[in-house]
């Protein structure tokens, strides 16, 4: 049975085997087409989600679709039901928390009272002044908290207590990529991890340990990538994996927060990378133990210089490393998180590509997660 499962796939009606390599090849080899059903699927970017959260204390903003203008949500008459609607619009199914925060002196958006219309937040028509003088600070999910804070050093062995959202994504029991838990159902990773194997069956996620071999595997229900961009083939290196059963959170299994839409990190901002990838370029061997390293944001202009990536780093990517080189992600780290700590940990980047590992002028290039929030929310909403 194990051999059969490894090399063959069973079609139904009539029952017969086809070679596993015919799965997800774009051809209907089973009479009912089930060999093309459980495959990596692409999902378009979709319409603009009409709510978003700002890095200014996670305050809620609402889009007026008629004018294309964004407004800050006033706390007046804001209810739990409205909070749930806002989070559902972003695809969250968990119970949100919200509080009032004072309107700051730098408030640049108009502040309006919020109401609901057919399960979408709307601005109240006769919205007068914001009497409470407060904005809505909204959290759709408790995320980005770990049991242990890492020390700031070069590269060292990591503990799952520091990074409870880190997972190993495996094909046929072999580690292929890293990934990050975003909520009980969803793991964030890189699209290029699935280039070779587009059938969902053999992909598994392992969570809750910093040792590669030692944790139970979780079945995957769906793998969703964003539509390919034929003008910028290295863009859109992002994927979402939906787990068959929701995760139970614990001290070693927890979600990381998505970034805020306006999370613009300045050069030299400290960041963290983790993974089980190669410890040296062309080193040929994964690390059995999770490794962590502190890096920093590298200016895109510097990263695109003639002695570096020569314009290949787009606005939907970001660079991170250390100016002198030597600390970087490598093969096997792909899909893992590039993390920023404010009040909570946020996944600001996804390990994507680079020339070599650790070179001084060619740092790691990461998918900029804030550029894909709209896509993530649309995928989640479609799967609610």
């Amino acid at each position: 049975k194990v051999i059969l499962d490894k090399y063959y796939f069973l079609c139904g009606q009539p029952l017969h085997f086809i070679p596993r390599k015919q799965l997800c090849d774009g051809e209907l080899d089973c009479p009912l087409g089930e060999d093309e059903e459980h495959c990596v699927k692409s999902f378009p970017e979709g319409p603009a989600v009409a709510v978003r959260l700002s890095k200014d204390r996670s305050t809620l903003q609402v889009l007026d679709s008629a004018t294309g203008n964004w407004f800050s949500a006033c706390f007046d008459n804001f209810t739990e039901a409205l909070a749930e609607t806002a989070c559902r619009q972003m695809g969250y199914s968990s119970k949100p928390t919200f509080r009032a925060v004072e309107i700051g002196p730098d408030q640049d958006l108009d502040v309006v009272e919020i109401t609901e219309n057919s399960q979408e937040l709307r601005m109240r028509n006769s919205s007068g002044p914001c009497l409470s003088g407060s904005l809505v600070s909204l959290h759709c999910l408790a995320c980005g908290k770990s049991l242990k804070t890492p020390r700031v050093v070069g590269v060292e062995e990591a503990s799952v207590d520091s990074w409870p959202w880190q997972v190993s994504i495996q094909y046929d029991k072999q580690h292929v990529c890293g990934g990050s838990i975003l909520d009980p159902h969803w793991v964030l990773t890189a699209a290029h991890c699935f280039r070779k194997h587009t059938d969902v069956f053999n992909w598994k996620v392992r969570a809750g340990s910093d040792k590669l071999g030692s944790f139970p595997s979780l079945a995957v229900a769906k793998i969703i990538i964003i539509e390919f961009n034929p003008m910028y083939p290295k863009d859109n290196d992002i994927a979402l994996m939906k787990l068959q059963f929701p995760l139970t959170f614990s001290g070693t299994v927890r979600p990381i927060c998505l970034p805020f839409f306006d999370e613009e990190l300045t050069p030299a901002t400290p960041l963290w990378i983790i993974g089980w990838g190669f410890t040296k370029q062309n080193g040929g061997k994964m690390s059995d133990i999770l490794l962590q390293a502190s890096v920093q944001v590298i200016d895109s202009t510097r990263c695109n210089a003639d002695d570096a990536y020569q314009g290949e780093v787009t606005e939907k990517m970001m660079c991170a490393g250390i100016p002198e080189g030597g600390v970087d992600t490598c093969q096997g780290d792909s899909g893992g998180p590039l993390m920023y700590q404010s009040d909570q940990w946020h996944v600001v980047g996804i390990v994507s590509w680079g020339y070599g590992c650790g070179g001084p002028s060619t740092p790691g290039v990461y998918t900029k997660v804030s550029a894909y929030l709209n896509w993530i929310y649309n995928v989640w909403k479609a799967e609610l």
């Epitope: 378009p44 970017e45 539509e227 390919f228 961009n229 034929p230 003008m231 910028y232 083939p233 290295k234 863009d235 990536y309 020569q310 314009g311 290949e312 787009t314 606005e315 939907k316």
Partner: antibody, heavy 119, light 107 residues
Framework: QVQLVQSGAEVKKPGASVKVSCKAS????????MHWVRQAPGQGLEWMGW????????GYAQKFQGRVTMTRDTSTSTVYMELSSLRSEDTAVYYC????????????WGQGTLVTVSS | DIQMTQSPSSLSASVGDRVTITCRAS??????LAWYQQKPGKAPKLLIY???SLESGVPSRFSGSGSGTDFTLTISSLQPEDFATYYC?????????FGPGTKVDIK
């Protein structure tokens, strides 16, 4: 030097198919994406689809889905674009165009192939 | 699909003039914009990519600017060989789309 040389002009009847070729030289054929763009007489440019000559993967504009097929022959460094169920509005000059190595624009174009669809 | 509009649709200018062509996207496209020049009976030629990067071999009198929804192609001093039609193209979202073109002819 980089060259994209396309096949000659074609006259086709409505309902027929046409296959246009584009032979690449002067660079590593499998290292660059190839796209097809068409231009009806006196009109603007219309993107049709792309092909990765290395993997053979393709993607087409919704408008042409089901009617267009892009293929390649790596032994001759040639890409092909076949358009079926031709109608008079398919009369156009068809261009193959190479995507810049780092993306963002088409740096080399074929000379164009005029396809005329007429009964 | 993202719609691209160009203005003006045509313009008449003299050699030595400074010429500006604008391109507008129906939604934000960052800097994912290219400009092409096409002469009658010829294939288009890439001038600018990533909104403002000059393609190698293109004269420095051509420049591009803009980000988001509004973009500009500027020819600082029009030369006889610059009389042609100019197209913008977005590469931000599938499918790539072109503007309708701006024809620059001799005054």
């Amino acid at each position: 030097q980089v060259q994209l040389v396309q096949s000659g002009a074609e006259v086709k009847k409505p309902g027929a198919s046409v296959k246009v070729s584009c032979k690449a030289s002067g660079y590593t054929f499998t290292g660059y994406y190839m796209h097809w763009v068409r231009q009806a007489p006196g009109q603007g440019l219309e993107w049709m689809g792309w092909m990765n000559p290395n993997s053979g993967n393709t993607g087409y504009a919704q408008k042409f889905q089901g009617r267009v097929t892009m293929t390649r022959d790596t032994s001759t460094s040639t890409v092909y674009m076949e358009l079926s169920s031709l109608r008079s509005e398919d009369t156009a000059v068809y261009y193959c165009a190479r995507l810049r190595a780092k993306g963002g624009g088409f740096d080399y174009w074929g000379q164009g192939t005029l396809v005329t669809v007429s009964s | 699909d993202i719609q691209m509009t160009q203005s003006p649709s045509s313009l008449s200018a003299s050699v030595g003039d400074r010429v500006t062509i604008t391109c507008r996207a129906s939604q934000g496209i960052g800097n994912y914009l290219a400009w092409y020049q096409q002469k009658p009976g010829k294939a288009p030629k890439l001038l600018i990519y990533a909104a403002s990067s000059l393609e190698s071999g293109v004269p420095s009198r051509f420049s591009g600017s803009g980000s988001g929804t509004d973009f500009t192609l500027t020819i600082s001093s029009l030369q006889p060989e610059d009389f042609a039609t100019y197209y913008c193209q977005q590469g931000y979202r599938f499918p790539p789309t072109f503007g309708p073109g701006t024809k620059v002819d001799i005054k």
